[in-house]
């Protein structure tokens, strides 16, 4: 039972529509068939779980219906998208990967992606 390395980009800027995407890549030491991916957010000395999904290798990630996250997997990479972000959601988003099956259990936690969210300026009234 060991730790594994998880890589993710240092910084991502959310789109004007409040959508941020980043890749979470893990160095799988074995042939995992069941993987759990959790996105954590650290801000103001507090860590909260943003979303989590368990998937079988080769299948799509399935988040809860009301989740703000979506994602796809390809080999040892997970492409994560977080939507509905506002400026107050700016923070460090951390990718946590667990290889659940078969044993042994492996755990890896990335260094985090700082996501910056800038609320769009409201459009000025126009006569046109």
């Amino acid at each position: 039972c060991k730790a594994m390395h998880v890589a993710q980009p240092a910084v991502v800027l959310a789109s004007s529509r409040g959508i941020a995407s980043f890749v979470c890549e893990y160095a799988s030491p074995g042939k995992a068939t069941e993987v759990r991916v959790t996105v954590l957010r650290q801000a103001d000395s507090q860590v909260t779980e943003v979303c989590a999904a368990t998937y079988m290798m080769g299948n799509e990630l399935t988040f809860l219906d009301d989740s703000i996250c979506t994602g796809t997997s390809s080999g040892n990479q997970v492409n994560l998208t977080i939507q509905g972000l506002r400026a107050m959601d700016t923070g460090l988003y951390i990718c946590k990967v667990e290889l659940m099956y078969p044993p042994p259990y492996y755990l890896g936690i990335g260094n985090g992606t700082q996501i910056y969210v800038i609320d769009p300026e409201p459009c000025p009234d126009s006569d046109f």
Epitope: C1, L40, V47, E98
Partner: nanobody
Framework: EVQLVESGGGLVQPGGSLRLSCAAS????????LGWFRQAPGKGREAVST???????SYADSVKGRFTISRDNAKNTLYLQMNSLRPEDTAVYYC????????????????????????WGQGTLVTVSS
Amino acid sequence: EVQLVESGGGLVQPGGSLRLSCAASGYTYSRHCLGWFRQAPGKGREAVSTISSGGSTSYADSVKGRFTISRDNAKNTLYLQMNSLRPEDTAVYYCAIGPNPRYCSGAPQTRGAEHYFGYWGQGTLVTVSS
């Protein structure tokens, strides 16, 4: 398989001392974070103290100056020396391993820091009461 086994808990009077131990096996990663957490009845788990693989230590404000964390690498054992115990220290104490040392020093000042740890012992109960 990783195993963490805590011991040393018990009933102690206010102002007394206890030394908790956590014997670890099955974990071979060299760069990691070891921590002590506690969970009082009806409350969430909170980080008490952490120690990095390099030996840097960190403490929650509520235990600073009273608790001391240490490790014996030769014995694969983590310790928590608890002095000047108070009734509010009553809780189940857990040791844990975190795989990323980046989050080690800040854990005792961070709510929800348990998310950074993935391997847990079964816990040992500490009761401070007269």
